[in-house]
């Protein structure tokens, strides 16, 4: 199997950003959990959320109220999440880490860009 994501996700300031992470596996493969983290050079990873096949979505304190699953219907192989109300400080690199059975673990990174639209008054 392999992970499908985007290299870059671009949203306008204040919009919700969908962070895609889909496991395209062989027949019979299952996703046990998907962990999302923000990754910055030299800082390690800051945990965002964990999607667990048994225990559901858990969101870390720093992102409480800001991370959700996309609305149903949901595919059990889809580990995508929504980051609500994107701000400029959210701009950076994110990683999804997917634990599957029986194929093992996979990870993929994407960059989130947050566009600030300046209004010009004439």
């Amino acid at each position: 199997g392999e992970l499908e994501t985007s290299d870059v996700v671009t949203v306008v300031l204040g919009q919700d950003a969908k962070l895609p992470c889909f496991y395209r596996g062989d027949s019979g493969e299952q996703v046990g959990q998907v962990a999302w983290a923000r990754v910055d050079a030299g800082e390690g990873a800051q945990e965002l959320a964990l999607l667990h096949s048994k225990y559901g979505l858990h969101v870390s304190p720093a992102y409480e109220g800001r991370v959700e699953q996309p609305p149903p219907p949901r595919n059990p192989l889809d580990g995508s999440v929504l980051l609500r109300n994107a701000v400029q400080a959210d701009e950076g690199e994110y990683e999804c880490r997917v634990s599957t059975f029986p194929a093992g673990s996979f990870q993929a990174r994407l960059r989130l860009r947050v566009l600030v639209h300046h209004h010009h008054h004439h």
């Epitope: 962990a35 800082e43 990873a45 945990e47 858990h58 304190p61």
Partner: antibody
Framework: EVQLVESGGGLVQPGGSLRLSCAAS????????MHWVRQAPGKGLVWVSR????????NYADSVKGRFTFSRDNAKNTLYLQMNSLRAEDTAVYFC?????????WGQGTLVTVSS | EIVMTQSPATLPVSPGERATLSCRAS??????LAWYQQKPGQAPRLLIY???TRATGIPARFSGSGSGTEFTLTISGLQSEDFAVYYC?????????FGQGTKVEIK
Amino acid sequence: EVQLVESGGGLVQPGGSLRLSCAASGFTFSRYWMHWVRQAPGKGLVWVSRINSDGSSSNYADSVKGRFTFSRDNAKNTLYLQMNSLRAEDTAVYFCVRDNWYFDYWGQGTLVTVSS
Amino acid sequence: EIVMTQSPATLPVSPGERATLSCRASQSVSINLAWYQQKPGQAPRLLIYGVSTRATGIPARFSGSGSGTEFTLTISGLQSEDFAVYYCQQYNNWPRTFGQGTKVEIK
């Protein structure tokens, strides 16, 4: 490299006050919740307090509620724990800790001794 | 508040042997469980989070398992630097709570 360095511990009389500080470096301080955890001599780890990333919200263990105040200055990358009405049972090493959901980085601790 | 109970309080083990430490939660903590190692005079160090994920730089001889209320930390092939106190902690609910610790000592 992530570093947390506590200071401000010392000997204080019962009923007295002390302010602990924790200087953070090596990470984007303003993005992380932070905690204080304490450990009495020869005892286990006990969570004391937490503060959210912008300093607008804090919570406390029942044993220190109303006596301790946790604050932060994100411009200075520094945490503060103001401890008032100190009691003998507050004697402990106080660690400042980074919250990454789990507690991934700990300072070396500062010893607070409350004794007459 | 969730009460975390560790057993045994002290575990005598010979170097090279396996150590098995237990941690029980008074209610389900899902998989939001971490293990820490603490040596005398030092700060605790994160070993494992999410029940079974080793923190950066932690050797493969440390492994974690379990879910819900029952958890285990296994140290296979104990080395001299592994003799320490080990704490479990739940981060599923507020307040965060720790077990009382298990001291792994030389047999």
